[in-house]
Amino acid sequence: DAHKSEVAHRFKDLGEENFKALVLIAFAQYLQQCPFEDHVKLVNEVTEFAKTCVADESAENCDKSLHTLFGDKLCTVATLRETYGEMADCCAKQEPERNECFLQHKDDNPNLPRLVRPEVDVMCTAFHDNEETFLKKYLYEIARRHPYFYAPELLFFAKRYKAAFTECCQAADKAACLLPKLDELRDEGKASSAKQRLKCASLQKFGERAFKAWAVARLSQRFPKAEFAEVSKLVTDLTKVHTECCHGDLLECADDRADLAKYICENQDSISSKLKECCEKPLLEKSHCIAEVENDEMPADLPSLAADFVESKDVCKNYAEAKDVFLGMFLYEYARRHPDYSVVLLLRLAKTYETTLEKCCAAADPHECYAKVFDEFKPLVEEPQNLIKQNCELFEQLGEYKFQNALLVRYTKKVPQVSTPTLVEVSRNLGKVGSKCCKHPEAKRMPCAEDYLSVVLNQLCVLHEKTPVSDRVTKCCTESLVNRRPCFSALEVDETYVPKEFNAETFTFHADICTLSEKERQIKKQTALVELVKHKPKATKEQLKAVMDDFAAFVEKCCKADDKETCFAEEGKKLVAASQAALGL
């Protein structure tokens, strides 16, 4: 399938609009600090060059790889050294090392200003004035803040973003129409970014085998009627797509994702009965729909797993002949029977099975040795079930905000060295598991909760990797992808932690808190809570509750005062002093 000119091939496959959008995303994900105008200029230059190659694939430089072309273009940026420091050293390398170097410098937490939403009329004017620039700016701002965002999916978000403005800027009440749509896109976008970040971490930190195992389990749950060979083909293709996107090969990734969607729709009879509606949609919607499609019904007459994987005398023979294929079949068979299990639980079971076979197939009596392997699964299954039951009860008792606070205290005590903004962000997201999953019936709770927690804990892992401060976080993040959540759950209070020096400035608040949204006000309070725990890790729940209740009352009182600033100054000093006394600081 070799093409004389890779850039011409991708331009023709994707079309000019998608080509330009994907190159912009790729550049913004690599050079996250560059101004919008600079990126647009680079994209236009690459696009003009691609067009010359479409016209004549033998033209000069058209035979170069996309990494060479894009890397050369990025390395023309004049301010590379002063803006990016050592990333400029990447430009001295040859491909493929140069691209690897750029990838290593992607920043999960770039020092960029928070995106502030302008007034609706201002946005609508900008949209009408120059729709193309407005949408490009959206791609640019999201891509540079989320350097692993799944690029073809970002095109889908941009399409919905455009549709929202097209509809709402003509509406009688523009704000009532537009703002809920933008909120939904923002929340879905953050979730999509975090899910993709886990896929990339899985590939980059744990390798292709780990990703393929995840994909086998998930696709077998989703398509339980599909044959193992069919699932294996989908897993291979999906792995290629995500390897490309995570590696910065966005044009190839988008092209291959489109091919995969086409294949799935052409073969839906042998894959799933749930794909019909998805397959009637246009390309971007179709790919998104397939990725989110509900699990198909399980075949009615599935035999017991024990026959092939425990009772058969050929277990060790089958395992020895093709270990990964046999384990893949085990995972496929187990997962298609258990849509009620999380993917990570299924992977733990498969790992336990593998470990048992490794040990037993070398024993004097293998069958006797592995006969009870399924009994070892019971505690592995019960652990997440019990954890979810307890936490859903706590969530129902406390509500989301106070449940988040309970998790903030729990995680700050486990890993107090982690930065306060990271602890707040991660604990708030962990706390959202309640509203997201606890409403589901038992059969859907575990896949919802534990797989969501895997995504959130990966955020902690990637943020911590940038500036490592805790050996315990490093250990839980790097030892086993599927055991991250149990590893964090098992952490107790860090007894080695030396409490932070008390700093009254951390607990000094001003009248500006009164104009914040409820969410931002919560974040301020939760930041204070983390700092309190860092000062007094042995504080009891009751002590912390007393301080937080008073803090809430203090903010409420001062926001109603005539002279708000004086109230915050005076009452704030008293609150600090009273809190110090109550906590014995």
Epitope: V547, K574, A582
Partner: nanobody, 118 residues
């Protein structure tokens, strides 16, 4: 209930010292804090120093290095030693006992006048 009575105020020349006392009747719990506030003519009341039952001290505003807060638990009394007084230290000094939750546990004395002449 807690009653607070301040004493020790008066007229004094700039550069001189005064010692204010605040005696509590009724019990302040171990998590309690006693603070001295002052209110200069035409200004808002401001907290200048606090001391907890456990002896934890905070100083605020422009009094650091000149004012010292201390307590005698046996006498249920908190003192504010004011040295190097300045005309801008003039005002009514109030004693305040408080602890969490503040909205329920906030007790005040009626104040003692301090006037510093230049």
């Amino acid at each position: 209930q807690v009653q607070l009575v301040e004493s020790g105020g008066g007229l004094v020349q700039a550069g001189k010292s005064l010692r204010l006392s605040c005696t509590a009747s009724g019990s302040i719990p171990s998590i309690g804090v006693t603070g001295w506030h002052r209110q200069a003519p035409g200004k808002q009341r401001e907290l200048v120093a606090t001391i907890s039952q456990g002896g934890h001290i905070n100083y605020f505003e422009s009094v650091k290095g000149r004012f010292t807060i201390s307590r005698d638990n046996a006498k249920n009394t908190v003192y504010l030693q004011m040295n190097s007084l300045k005309p801008e230290d003039t005002g009514v000094y109030y004693c305040n006992a408080f602890w969490l939750p503040l909205r329920l546990n906030d007790y005040w004395g009626q104040g003692t006048q301090v006037t510093v002449s230049s």
